[in-house]
Amino acid sequence: HLAVFPDTITGADSSQLLEVSGSCVNHSVTDEPPKMHCSAEGEWLVPIGKCMCKAGYEEKNGTCQVCRPGFFKASPHIQSCGKCPPHSYTHEEASTSCVCEKDYFRRESDPPTMACTRPPSAPRNAISNVNETSVFLEWIPPADTGGRKDVSYYIACKKCNSHAGVCEECGGHVRYLPRQSGLKNTSVMMVDLLAHTNYTFEIEAVNGVSDLSPGARQYVSVNVTTNQA
């Protein structure tokens, strides 16, 4: 099976089996070299090992045939070439992976059979509830998760001067409950804000490929003013 063996003269002893090493056909490889046993009756018996078509090739009619453009095979252990996953392509023969379309990405940890994905769109319908120097934010998930399940949220806090119209990072005095980044739920509480101060909170949706994208951040902004402490 995808292996060839040399013509072999049988041994004289009728009980004797001669072990013969074979070789893998073109574009095939093996983990365990193929061997067969030649009996005194001239029969091949007891095969050991096997050959597999290498990555980029599939078995058809006893030979290894190239994967055509649009198809790939990542490993010899996969039986046949498969279509490129969504949002990817290959224009090569013998492809072992597919290329992501423009604005789509694949993490190194994503398997080659997984669709290429993109960063999520912005969260939606953000609302705020101010209680003295605490703010509770709530939102709903993005309409487009980018094709990934690993969506989380990051909260950027900016303190704004209403007269000058200038905003600056809030700094370390603000506490986020449960946390500022890697939020899995769609709400967060900010405490220890300054009284009578204008704040802008940017709620950004991120996923596993957000850091691979050069595109603009996708966030929704909420403006709030804190009350008396």
Epitope: P69, Y89, E101
Partner: antibody
Framework: EVQLVESGGGLVQPGGSLKLSCAAS????????IHWVRQAPGKGLEWVAY????????YYADSVKGRFTISRDNSKNTLYLQMNSLRAEDTAVYYC?????????????WGQGTLVTVSS | DIVMTQSPDSLAVSLGERATINCKAS??????????MNWYQQKPGKAPKLLIY???NLESGIPDRFSGSGSGTDFTLTISRLEPEDAAVYYC?????????FGQGTKLEIK
């Protein structure tokens, strides 16, 4: 914006040679297969040749096999068609066209074409 | 080589009416459940434009009055409501195997 711009066409005598270029911009050139397609005056489209992004896959039409060579320089984002032993029947507008990314792929962007005239 | 034959060679259709162009391949252009058939539109002095890929998939930016159907060896391009700008030559092309042959073209005129 995806752009393909052909150049290098002109008048050449039968038996002569010409090298066409196709300058690409607006996409990751090295990952795209590109085709040459030609159109004789007043006639239909004829597919000529194809080269994949890594130059590992190359196909030719029977009518040009052995005379034309398709190649590319990914560092210059440029595709080439070296045409030797030219014949009168090679007279045509030559287009380069990009293979698309939506499967099964069509030729989704085309250049404006360059005219090659083979005549004595 | 796969030979692509279009019919008719030319047709004239009134504005707002339906136009149908057929393409027949000398052998199947299907592979693994997909039809490797594309349709292009070409206007005088211009480069061709991809309309339909994979027999029935509308290329981005193409009006939905264009549609494609068929599999195996027989394919159809349909323009459901003809507009003045649809006057052009239409080509089918198979990309199932090299060489990627085109049909001879069908000239569509507006009556």
């Amino acid at each position: 914006e995806v752009q393909l711009v052909e150049s290098g066409g002109g008048l050449v005598q039968p038996g002569g040679s010409l090298k066409l270029s196709c300058a690409a911009s607006g996409f990751t050139f090295s990952t795209f297969g590109i085709h040459w397609v030609r159109q004789a005056p007043g006639k239909g489209l004829e597919w000529v040749a194809y080269i994949s992004g890594a130059s590992t896959t190359i196909y030719y039409a029977d009518s040009v096999k052995g005379r034309f060579t398709i190649s590319r320089d990914n560092s210059k984002n440029t595709l080439y068609l070296q045409m030797n032993s030219l014949r009168a029947e090679d007279t045509a507008v030559y287009y380069c066209a990009r293979y698309g990314t939506s499967f099964p792929y069509g030729l989704d962007y085309w250049g404006q074409g360059t005219l090659v005239t083979v005549s004595s | 080589d796969i030979v692509m034959t279009q019919s008719p060679d030319s047709l004239a259709v009134s504005l707002g009416e339906r136009a149908t162009i057929n393409c027949k391949a000398s052998q199947s252009v299907d592979y693994d459940g997909d039809s490797y058939m594309n349709w292009y539109q070409q206007k005088p002095g211009k480069a061709p434009k991809l309309l339909i890929y994979g027999a029935s998939n509308l290329e981005s930016g193409i009006p939905d009055r264009f549609s494609g159907s068929g599999s195996g060896t027989d394919f159809t391009l349909t323009i459901s409501r003809l507009e003045p700008e649809d006057a052009a030559v239409y080509y089918c092309q198979q990309s199932n195997e090299d060489p990627f042959t085109f049909g001879q073209g069908t000239k569509l005129e507006i009556k």
